[in-house]
């Protein structure tokens, strides 16, 4: 019986530009977590981050794409077309798989704020 | 350039312990992932586990029981040890590096593998 | 386990032409697929990683492609030192599992 659940940074928003933090938290659960994968609105990898050998980000996302802090992933010289869904899929043995869900909404005005909190979705 | 070189025996009694060592050259086994992985004759390739660059290990959930992964880092090799085998484990077992954080879990440099047959 | 299905099983190709092989995976893997080539009495090589990019030294007529549960293997003209099998992979999840293999021949 899977019985975690994932906390994630919910709806953020952050200036073309600039950059973000991802960040998900899995709590509730003994399970095991032996990688956790970062993907995109379009179902694309960001990054993986395995329990053991640490993190691979993808080839695509190498120049603007950063590891952590922890779990999370930092991205880098946003662009508008970065608006969008982000998935963090935590594998774990036994539960099986946990998935939380961001949405980032990435702005042209100079005066965004950076707007984060964490949620269960 | 990355070297590795399986040896152990190549025949071993159902019940027994198989035991395959991996001797690595040109690359130090406190870098990167070290792997075994198997053939059973007419079946797909299987990824064993691994012992990681800080010696951790990780098992194929299949095999976890019965399998251990070991290294000497004075002698730069690492090794398999799988107990109570049957026929079934009867395979080409690959030793293997994979350098996670370029190719993520695709493995870039193989031993040559080695026939193991479980037979009484 | 994420079950990697290859198809066909064989193939046989004149050289020069070209040869494509399929994989499909169980379930959504995104692209962390991986493909080796196996020559005759050798061990399996390394050709593609993430889906779609070549390793280091592989030559430009294999190129790799595909996302979610789909991939392709593409050889856009076959030579004589292309025969073997050809393997699939994903890491998508541990424990990371293969493909059973396509035999590529020459005619």
């Known amino acids: 019986m899977m019985t975690g659940t994932i906390e994630t940074t919910g709806n953020i928003s952050a200036k073309k530009g600039g950059s973000v933090i991802l960040q998900c938290h899995l709590s509730s659960t003994m399970a095991q977590v032996t990688q956790v994968n970062w993907e995109q609105h379009d179902h694309s990898l960001l990054a993986i981050r395995n329990a053991e050998l640490g993190w691979h980000i993808y080839p695509a996302f190498k120049d603007r794409v950063a590891p952590g802090p922890g779990l999370g992933l930092t991205l880098q010289s946003l662009t508008m077309n970065d608006t969008g869904e982000y998935f963090c899929t935590y594998h774990t043995y036994p539960d099986g798989t946990y998935r939380g869900r961001i949405f980032l909404e990435v702005l042209e005005s100079s005066v965004a704020e950076h707007s984060a909190r964490f949620q269960i979705p | 350039e990355v070297q590795l070189q399986e040896s152990g025996p190549g025949l071993v009694k159902p019940s027994e312990t198989l035991s395959l060592t991996c001797a690595v050259s040109g690359y130090s086994i406190t870098s990167d992932s070290w792997n075994w992985i198997r053939q059973p004759p007419g079946k797909k390739l299987e990824w064993m586990g691994y012992i990681s660059y800080s010696g951790n290990t990780y098992y194929n959930p299949s095999l976890k029981s019965r399998i251990t992964i070991s290294r000497d880092t004075s002698k730069n090799q690492f090794s398999l040890k799988l107990s109570s085998v049957t026929a079934a484990d009867t395979a080409v077992y690959y030793c293997?590096?994979?350098?996670?954080?370029?190719?993520?879990?695709?493995?870039?440099?193989w031993g040559q593998g080695t026939t193991v047959t479980v037979s009484s | 386990d994420i079950v990697m299905t290859q198809t066909p099983l064989s193939l046989s190709v004149t050289p020069g032409q070209p040869a494509s092989i399929s994989c499909k995976a169980s379930?959504?893997?995104?692209?962390?697929v991986a493909w080796y080539q196996q020559k005759p009495g050798q061990s399996p090589q390394l050709m593609i990683y993430s889906a779609s990019y070549r390793y280091t030294g592989v030559p430009d007529r294999f190129s790799g492609s595909g996302s979610g549960t789909d991939f392709t293997l593409k050889i856009s003209r076959v030579e004589a030192e292309d025969v073997g099998v050809y393997y699939c992979q994903q890491y998508y999840t541990t424990p990371w599992t293969f493909g059973g293999g396509t035999k590529v021949e020459i005619k």
């Open positions: 379930q959504n893997v995104r692209t962390a």
């Open positions: 293997a590096r994979l350098d996670f954080s370029n190719y993520g879990g695709a493995v870039d440099y």
